[in-house]
């Protein structure tokens, strides 16, 4: 048994990428455990991550039910073992999270350039349509299926030998860029959610370069 009182969770933070959504909080528990509840503004409080000593809880299964809803979570603190609770009788300690709307707030993951080909004066670049954890009829939806025309990509490109950059935007997953024949180009892509005011761009993809010539040594 002990006399260390339970403390309420704090610094509740949503971490979400491509709808994979985890709630994190502090402190690391000492003589206490946590249970998380999640709710929509008008819905039920549903318990998850029961009696855990973790300081994170994967809430993906709940938020993917409707990514356009706004969610609120709360973290309950319960005494472990024979430890006294600071909550008044029958009142468990808990702390509320900030509100979270997945459609508006989930981070878009780093895009992957699936394929590219340069023929003559055209460079065609295709960005992979990544799967999310959102399901419909038992199958996982892609980013495009979730966001529709709200999702676009920005391609930033340059001649291999130059520092001058150009950009091109598409509402699809493909770019068709006018380039100079026989010149190598380097480029990267970024996803963009047009309807968002903040957090609207993804990280940049890994930069890829076309190979229009080989060195004399054949390297």
């Amino acid at each position: 048994s002990g006399t260390t009182n339970t403390v309420a969770a704090y610094n509740l933070t949503w971490k979400s990428t491509n709808f994979k959504t985890i709630l994190e909080w502090e402190p690391k528990p000492v003589n206490q455990v946590y249970t998380v509840q999640i709710s929509t503004k008008s819905g039920d409080w549903k318990s998850k991550c029961f009696y855990t000593t973790d300081t994170e809880c994967d809430l993906t299964d709940e938020i993917v039910k409707d990514v356009k809803q706004t969610y609120l979570a709360r973290v309950f603190s319960y005494p472990a073992g024979n430890v006294e609770s600071t909550g008044s009788a029958g009142e468990p300690l808990y702390e509320n999270s900030p509100e979270f709307t997945p459609y508006l707030e989930t981070n878009i993951g780093q895009p992957v350039i699936q394929k590219y080909e340069q023929g003559g004066t055209k460079l065609k670049v295709t960005v992979k349509d990544s799967f999310t954890l959102v399901r419909k009829n038992g199958t996982f939806l892609t980013l495009r299926q979730v966001f529709g025309n709200d999702l676009g990509y920005i391609l930033t490109y340059r001649k291999d030998s130059s520092t001058g950059r150009k950009t091109n935007t598409t509402h699809t997953n493909e770019f068709l860029i006018d380039v100079e024949k026989g010149v190598s180009y380097c480029f990267f892509a970024q996803a963009v959610i047009f309807s968002r005011k903040t957090n609207h761009k993804s990280p940049e993809s890994i930069t890829k370069c076309t190979e229009q010539w080989k060195s004399v040594l054949g390297e």
Partner: antibody, heavy 121, light 107 residues
């Protein structure tokens, strides 16, 4: 097959303590919480608390706080429930029940056969 | 603590009858409710979890549903082997709590 086997019946005097064991087999012991539920003669079911076998963390119903101690021995896949300062109203059948994990529903899908504890002077 | 009010406390029905038991939670518990069957002298057995999901191996005559804080457990066609006491249990809030039980007998 998956089963929970509990220790035999006990008769105790008021003020004494009792320790009931529950041996798990047929599944990975550390992956499921274990609960203790009691049932006084002719009465309903009452949840006492939970132990996470993987870390030994326990949470008790407030009613039993300070009187109950749940422990586990991972080497034998056994959980124990000790109840102290016994009184006549603690006379009951005590069940261990396997119940979910931190991410699963807390439904008691496997039960021990029960241990009758009689408190009498 | 969440109170689970189960009704009726006992009932008597004929073989083949449809039997309905209700459980009302004192506050919203989402669908975090399970149903158990306990035969005399035996440990309880899980029948329904998460309000409406049938546990593996449980006959399909048993079912569960939810409407707000009201939960219903149904035996579509009562069989002699269904003589038992049935309990609901919520797990949405600490501590976990059970209903008072419904004793089902055959007429």
């Amino acid at each position: 097959q998956v089963q929970l086997v509990q220790s035999g019946a006990e008769v105790k005097k008021p003020g004494a303590s009792v320790k009931v064991s529950c041996k798990a087999s047929g599944y990975t012991f550390a992956n499921y919480y274990m609960h203790w539920v009691r049932q006084a003669p002719g009465q309903g079911l009452e949840w006492m608390g939970i132990i996470n076998p993987s870390g030994g963390i326990t949470v008790y119903a407030q009613k039993f706080q300070g009187r109950v101690t749940m422990t586990r021995d991972t080497s034998t896949s056994t959980v124990y429930m000790e109840l102290s300062s016994l009184r006549s109203e603690d006379t009951a059948v005590y069940y261990c029940a396997r119940g979910g994990s931190k991410v699963a529903a807390l439904a008691f899908d496997i039960w021990g056969q029960g241990t009758m504890v009689t408190v009498s002077s | 603590d969440i109170q689970m009010t189960q009704s009726p406390s006992s009932l008597s029905a004929s073989v083949g009858d449809r039997v309905t038991i209700t459980c009302q939670a004192s506050q919203d518990i989402s669908n975090s409710l399970n149903w158990y069957q306990q035969k005399p002298g035996k440990a309880p057995k899980l029948l329904i979890y998460d309000a409406s999901n049938l546990e593996t191996g449980v006959p399909s005559r048993f079912s569960g549903s939810r409407s707000g804080t009201d939960f219903t457990f149904t035996i579509s066609s009562l069989q002699p082997e269904d003589i038992a006491t049935y309990y609901c249990q919520q797990y949405n809030f600490h501590p976990l709590t059970f209903g008072g039980g419904t004793k089902v007998e055959i007429k």
